[in-house]
Every structure is written in C-alpha cells, then in structure tokens.
C-alpha cells in the first residue's frame, strides 16, 4: 500500500441522502394524493376500502416521539416494497376500468422505486440492517370483478397515502438525530 492519499467526496452523504428521501417522499405523497382524488372523481368510493394483503399502518401520531432510525427505515422500506408490489399488480390486473389511469400509475411506480433505492442507499451508508423482517407474502390473485379492482385501487392509494404521511413526519424527526 502506498502513502495515504485523500479520496474526493462522493455525490452525497447520509444526511444528504435523508434530505433526498424526505423530498422524494413528499413528492410521492403529493402524487398519491392527486391520484386518489382522480380515483374518487372517476369511481366514487362508497366508504373506506381495505385489502388484507396491505401492510398495517406502522405509526401513529403518539408513537412519533419514540422513533428510532433503524426501525423507521426498515419498516418504511418493507411497507413501500409491499405497496410497490400492489401498484405493479394493479397495473397488470386492474382491467379496462383502470387503464385510463395507467400513465399516472406508471409514474407512481417509478417514483416509488426511486424512493426505495434512496432508502436502501441511506441504510447502506449507515450500515443498518437491510434484511426485511420475515413476513408472509400474500399472493395477489386477479380481482373478482371490475368493481373489485376499483375497490382495491382505492385501498392501495389510501393506504399508501397514510404510510407516506407518517413517513415524511418520521424522516423529518430522524434528521434531527443524525
């Protein structure tokens, strides 16, 4: 090995990665909100819809104060990977009624993938555990009907909206701890 030589700085550091993750999450939240509103306009929802395969909401306002960096990032990554799977499924199996929303769903998927890459980079740089906690992956079968796919879309977008909402708050809080 030769004499010590300095390395030039790379493009970002963990704190910049966290800033970037906050911006991406906010942007994705705005997209999700807009798409959910479009869904409500085109296909009015009769009450709240749920889907057993969706992750349960990780955080509530009361638990925000006790958040720890590893837990938040791991949980957020796992939940967003599940939502990514559901968005891919919607695009594939949603049927003709959801075809009109294809460009928006495609853009949503791309942004979700980008946010997941940024979270993974952040976790790598911090050397936090990256393995997703073992949880059964519920296979997603085709929707029972056209109305079934619309109800599923309402549930997916609604759940993603809530997840991203707590994610923005959680990530902003974590910024103060890094």
């Amino acid at each position: 090995p030769g004499p010590p030589a300095g390395s030039p700085r790379v493009s970002s550091d963990p704190r910049a990665d966290l800033d970037s993750a906050v911006l991406l999450t906010r942007s994705l939240l705005a997209d999700t909100r807009q798409l959910a509103a479009q869904m409500r306009d085109k296909f009015p929802a009769d009450g709240d819809h749920s889907l057993d395969s969706l992750p349960t909401l990780a955080m509530s306002a009361g638990t925000l104060g006790s958040l720890q960096l590893p837990g938040v990032l791991t949980r957020l990554r796992v939940d967003l990977m599940s939502y990514l799977r559901h968005v891919q499924w919607l695009r594939r199996a949603g049927g003709p009624s959801l075809k009109t929303l294809e460009p928006e769903l495609g853009a949503l998927q791309a942004r979700l993938e980008r946010l997941l890459r940024r979270l993974q980079l952040l976790m790598s740089r911090l050397a936090l555990p990256q393995a997703a906690p073992d949880q059964p992956v519920i296979p997603l079968g085709p929707p029972a009907s056209a109305w079934g796919s619309i109800r599923a879309a309402h549930a997916i977008l609604g759940g993603l909206h809530l997840t991203l909402d707590w994610a923005v708050r959680g990530l902003l809080l974590l910024k103060t701890r890094l």
Epitope: R9, Q120, L121, S124, R125, A127, L128, P129, A131, L178
Partner: antibody, heavy 114, light 112 residues
Framework: EVQLLESGGGLVQPGGSLRLSCAAS????????MHWVRQAPGKGLEWVAV????????YYADSVKGRFTISRDNSKNTLYLQMNSLRAEDTAVYYC???????WGQGTLVTVSS | QSVLTQPPSASGTPGQRVTISCSGS?????????VHWYQQLPGTAPKLLIY???ERPSGVPDRFSGSKSGTSASLAISGLRSEDEADYYC???????????FGGGTKLTVLG
C-alpha cells in the same frame, strides 16, 4: 478531502493478537457505517466486518466470527478491529472503508507467520 | 469462491467498449439490493466507481456506466483507455451474510 488512515498492522505469530486502528478525517465520521475489508496477496476483496454509524449494529464474515471484534469511538473519529487467535489465512492487507463503502483507506498489511 | 460471480478477465483495445458482468442470487442482487462497482488500479486501494446500480460519484467519467436486471448486473466502459487497466469488483448486500459481498474481481487488460 476524505482521509482514512489505518495503522497497527505487522508480523504476528499464529494464535497471536493485533489491534488495527483507522483514523478518519474530512467527513462526518459519526454519520457513516464503517467496514473492514481485506485482500490476501494476489487475491480479491473479502469483507470482514461492519459497524453501524452509532455502533449499535455489528456484523462479521463467517471466517472471522468469534475471533475479530469491530468497534468505534465517534468522539475520536476512530474505527478499530481487535483480531485474536490469528491464523495464516488471515494474512492480508486490511482496508478501513466508510459508507457503501464510498471511501477507502490505503490499507495496512497483517502477516501471520511463525 | 465468491458469492457474486465475475469473469476473471476481460480485454479490449483503446476506444472499444467492454462490459463486465456480475451474477448474484436471490439473497443479494435478486432481493432488490443495489450493486456497487469498484476500480482497483495496480498497487492502490479500491475506489468507488458506480453506486446504486448506475450512479457515478463526482469525478468519475461518464464513460463508466452500470446497469442491473434480475439477479445480475453489469459495468460498461466505453472509449477504453490505457489507464482503465485495473481490477474491477462488484459488490452488493447479502441477506444470508448480513453484510456486503464482493465479486471475485475482473482483471481488465487494455491491448495495444
């Protein structure tokens, strides 16, 4: 400019111990996970151990588990590797690396031989 | 034997484009983990060349590019130059090891 400077390498007998240190400067050390990666003469890179930014998580390669201990002191911007029960196959240049790893030191040579 | 598989050698003439592959499994690249690439010039420490599959650190020429698909990844070097002669390593996180794994390395020779 980022600098990682390893020290503590040298010649040691099989079964012996060594403690490597890595002094970091030019970046926020406490925000980065830190690794030790080694390279045996004429061979490829082998990851040895990693410690999270705050020291709460530590992982080791199977080949060193139970013999090596990684630690850090964020107040001194320093990373450590305590190596016990050294074997001939541990002979290598040991690099300290930060992040992905994004940054690498120049390495310190550890030779285990009788 | 490395967890990530790379060809031991590759070669090309100046100006050519060469590609180096990196094949993994479902516990690393196939699990969605990003792939990073390192360049190690003779007698020096490794240097980060590509991170997160296709992002270049500042200072790395755009002749270097990365891509990832399924359980494999590749590094492409276009407009090959004599100073590109080095060992190239891919790396990714591996669930089964709870740490990063490296490929065995590819020695790139620039002919002529």
């Amino acid at each position: 400019e980022v600098q990682l400077l390893e020290s503590g390498g040298g010649l040691v007998q099989p079964g012996g111990s060594l403690r490597l240190s890595c002094a970091a400067s030019g970046f926020t050390f406490s925000s980065y996970g830190m690794h030790w990666v080694r390279q045996a003469p004429g061979k490829g890179l082998e990851w040895v151990a990693v410690i999270s930014y705050d020291g709460s998580y530590k992982y080791y390669a199977d080949s060193v588990k139970g013999r090596f201990t990684i630690s850090r002191d964020n107040s001194k911007n320093t990373l450590y590797l305590q190596m016990n029960s050294l074997r001939a196959e541990d002979t290598a240049v040991y690099y300290c690396a930060a992040g992905v790893p994004d940054y690498w030191g120049q390495g310190t040579l550890v030779t285990v031989s009788s | 034997q490395s967890v990530l598989t790379q060809p031991p050698s590759a070669s090309g003439t100046p100006g050519q484009r060469v590609t180096i592959s990196c094949s993994g499994s479902s516990s690393n690249i196939g699990s969605g983990y990003d792939v990073h690439w390192y360049q190690q010039l003779p007698g020096t420490a490794p240097k980060l060349l590509i991170y997160s599959n296709n992002e270049r650190p500042s200072g790395v020429p755009d002749r270097f590019s990365g891509s990832k698909s399924g359980t494999s990844a590749s590094l492409a070097i276009s407009g090959l130059r004599s100073e590109d002669e080095a060992d190239y390593y891919c790396a990714a996180w591996d669930d089964s090891l709870s740490g990063p794994v490296f490929g065995g390395g590819t020695k790139l020779t620039v002919l002529g």
